[in-house]
Interface confidence: medium
């Protein structure tokens, strides 16, 4: 058993049929010694008396808010949550496996630049009685500070018969060094509580590996005289790290016909312009990627050829 | 050329070669990309690699003030990785012939380090990997980890030379 926060405790249980459970001793936070009784949740049934209460925690029915009273007055509370371990593996019932980039990916994180700011998100099908708490650091043995905000519900989607809820959190490294080569990964830890079930999820990454630039901005076409060719130009996204002579991007320019089956013409360039042939009803798209490190491509920025 | 006395390197040449290094480091990665990382473990070999850290002067402002600190750090890293790529870890099977990306990477690391420090000039305190032989089962995993680490190192080096070529070239 360990303390998650004041008056909230997590009991770690091996979860299998007829498991013996864990013996837990609760102590009433009071100077009083006599006349103390214990109840669980809203029930008025007295579970025991005395300053301490010893219970055998085996299942969710044994978890909940234990309250000690004296003469009708509440003295203190202890909320017990359960953390299940099945076949040596901690349960992951609350969050959905996003399966990208690999199986057992519950948290996904992205950064728009090297400033030390990043966003993580996760999915669940649970709509109520759900709380999240996020902590982060750079490195684990001698952790350096990363400050995370509160997790918020950022999207709701319908997936077949189920509703899916997306939560996200923004974090900022306290003393970021954008130009340095990271040697210690960022660690992100999410505590999830659904009713009386506790679970924790972690992710470990380098900012460089989660970089995904915003799409190029101000995408424009300039027809070239007496030619089917056009000059496409664009600019670095505002959110990208500066100076651009140091934090350089590379670009992919694509000409795509109306039909998905039509052959796509692609050009790769380090410049912020390119000359392409604009076909009728086609569109021109440009996306960006860090020039020197193969992290994710941005989403496409597009304009119609006409 | 970045000689220890403090004259400027051939920024444009260094930029071109460091960008090639980035490409090679990523094309070498698939050679070990199928790695099963379950046998993970923090081997000393990859813990000791020199990193370009915050105080090494490799940021745009540091380069403007005095690029020598940063260039020395890059040179140390290039020599370190060049030695690693010639070590037991990268020798032999799966075949790493000179025309493989790892072979070219090895040669390019040497080329860039020589551009930065021609024969006869010496920067002190070079960190050289002291390698105890890797166990055979560790070899593919170590290749994977070293190449991942090298990709990060050469990315920073390439940014330095690109910025130098754009803003510090005579």
């Amino acid at each position: 058993i360990w303390e998650l926060k004041k008056d909230v405790y997590v009991v770690e249980l091996d979860w299998y049929p007829d498991a013996p459970g864990e013996m837990v001793v609760l102590t009433c936070d009071t100077p009083e010694e006599d006349g103390i009784t214990w109840t669980l949740d809203q029930s008025s049934e007295v579970l025991g008396s005395g300053k301490t209460l010893t219970i055998q925690v085996k299942e969710f029915g044994d978890a909940g808010q234990y309250t000690c009273h004296k003469g009708g007055e509440v003295l203190s509370h202890s909320l017990l949550l359960l953390h299940k371990k099945e076949d040596g593996i901690w349960s992951t019932d609350i969050l959905k496996d996003q399966k990208e980039p690999k199986n057992k990916t519950f948290l996904r994180c992205e950064a728009k630049n090297y400033s030390g700011r990043f966003t993580c998100w996760w999915l669940t099908t649970i709509s109520t009685d759900l709380t999240f708490s996020v902590k982060s650091s750079r490195g684990s043995s001698d952790p350096q500070g990363v400050t995370c905000g509160a997790a918020t519900l950022s999207a709701e989607r319908v997936r077949g018969d189920n509703k899916e809820y997306e939560y996200s959190v923004e974090c900022q490294e306290d003393s970021a060094c954008p130009a340095a080569e990271e040697s210690l990964p960022i660690e992100v830890m999410v505590d999830a509580v659904h009713k009386l079930k506790y679970e924790n999820y972690t992710s470990s990454f380098f900012i460089r590996d989660i970089i995904k630039p915003d799409p190029p901005k101000n995408l424009q076409l300039k027809p070239l005289k007496n030619s089917r060719q056009v000059e496409v130009s664009w600019e670095y996204p505002d959110t990208w790290s500066t100076p651009h002579s140091y934090f350089s991007l590379t670009f992919c320019v694509q000409v795509q016909g109306k039909s998905k089956r039509e052959k796509k013409d692609r050009v790769f360039t380090d410049k912020t312009s390119a000359t392409v042939i604009c076909r009728k009803n086609a569109s021109i798209s440009v996306r960006a990627q860090d020039r020197y490190y193969s992290s994710s491509w941005s989403e496409w920025a597009s304009v119609p050829c006409s | 050329r970045a000689v220890p006395g403090g004259s400027s390197p051939a920024w444009t040449q260094c930029q071109q070669l460091s960008q090639k290094l980035c490409t090679l480091a990523w094309s070498a990665h698939p050679l070990v990309g199928h790695m099963d990382l379950r046998e993970e473990g923090d081997e000393e070999t990859t813990n000791d690699v020199p990193h370009i850290q915050c105080g090494d002067g490799c940021d745009p402002q540091g380069l403007r003030d005095n690029s020598q600190f940063c260039l020395q750090r890059i040179h140390q890293g290039l020599i370190f990785y060049e030695k690693l790529l010639g070590s037991d870890i990268f020798t032999g099977e799966p075949s790493l012939l000179p025309d493989s990306p790892v072979g070219q990477l090895h040669a390019s690391l040497l080329g860039l380090s020589q551009l930065l420090q021609p024969e006869g000039h010496h920067w002190e305190t070079q960190q050289i990997p002291s390698l105890s032989p890797s166990q055979p089962w560790q070899r593919l995993l170590l290749r994977f980890k070293i190449l991942r680490s090298l990709q990060a190192f050469v990315a920073v080096a390439a940014r330095v030379f690109a910025h130098g070529a754009a803003t510090l070239s005579p």
Epitope: - | K83, D88, E93
Partner: antibody, heavy 115, light 107 residues
Framework: EVQLQQSGPELVKPGASVKMSCKAS????????MNWVKQKPGQGLEWIGY????????NYNEKFKGKATLTSDKSSTTAYMELSSLTSEDSAVYYC????????WGQGTTLTVSS | DIVMTQSPATLSVTPGDRVSLSCRAS??????LYWYQQKSHESPRLLIK???QSISGIPSRFSGSGSGSDFTLSINSVEPEDVGMYYC?????????FGGGTKLEIK
């Protein structure tokens, strides 16, 4: 194809030393390790160690430390093994073997230690 | 050191037979196992690497299987020229160690 040409048979007296050679052709000498393996008459195989010709790094079987010394010469693409303080126990065929996978074997050098 | 044990010590077969040679490691060596053939008065030659990967130039009748600590070399239709000693080798950890060998002979 890799070919390994080993030096000829040796007859030496107990207590002496011997240095045998293995010339490699058809491969990039410095890109592969060279192993040495011992086989006593009518018996099995024992791995002695290897040398990495790129940086002269060596790795020995504990059993052969102090007995075998592995060296190489890049310019002639030749690996060498020196055996010291010879006894009759050292009488055997010694093979040089290319690569981690022991994929190409020399024809063997027969060493006879006898007074 | 990892001890490699081969069985049987000798195998007498008739041409055309399918035979299996066994090799056991004293601890798990994953798939880092090699098989060699040594004919009389010749150097050994590599038959199989990584427990089951075939080697170019080696007849397809030779195949390997197994992982962890139990391995098998199979010859699916023995030819008279297959006589000789067969050795397995631990390629997982140094020092490399070899099995004592299985002698394959024709009845």
């Amino acid at each position: 194809e890799v070919q390994l040409q080993q030096s000829g048979p040796e007859l030496v007296k107990p207590g002496a030393s011997v240095k045998m050679s293995c010339k490699a052709s058809g491969n990039t000498f410095t890109r592969y390790v060279m192993n040495w393996v011992k086989q006593k008459p009518g018996q099995g195989l024992e791995w002695i160690g290897y040398i990495n010709p790129y940086n002269d790094g060596t790795n020995y079987n504990e059993k052969f430390k102090g007995k075998a010394t592995l060296t190489s010469d890049k310019s002639s693409t030749t690996a060498y093994m020196e055996l010291s303080s010879l006894t009759s126990e050292d009488s055997a065929v010694y093979y040089c073997v290319h690569n981690w996978d022991l994929d190409y074997w020399g024809q063997g050098t027969t060493l006879t230690v006898s007074s | 050191d990892i001890v490699m044990t081969q069985s049987p010590a000798t195998l007498s077969v008739t041409p055309g037979d399918r035979v299996s040679l066994s090799c056991r490691a004293s601890q798990s060596i994953s798939h880092y196992l090699y098989w060699y053939q040594q004919k009389s008065h010749e150097s050994p030659r590599l038959l199989i690497k990584y427990a089951s990967q075939s080697i170019s130039g080696i007849p397809s009748r030779f195949s390997g299987s197994g992982s962890g600590s139990d391995f098998t070399l199979s010859i699916n239709s023995v030819e008279p020229e297959d006589v000789g000693m067969y050795y397995c080798q631990n390629g997982h950890s140094f020092p490399y160690t070899f099995g004592g060998g299985t002698k394959l002979e024709i009845k």
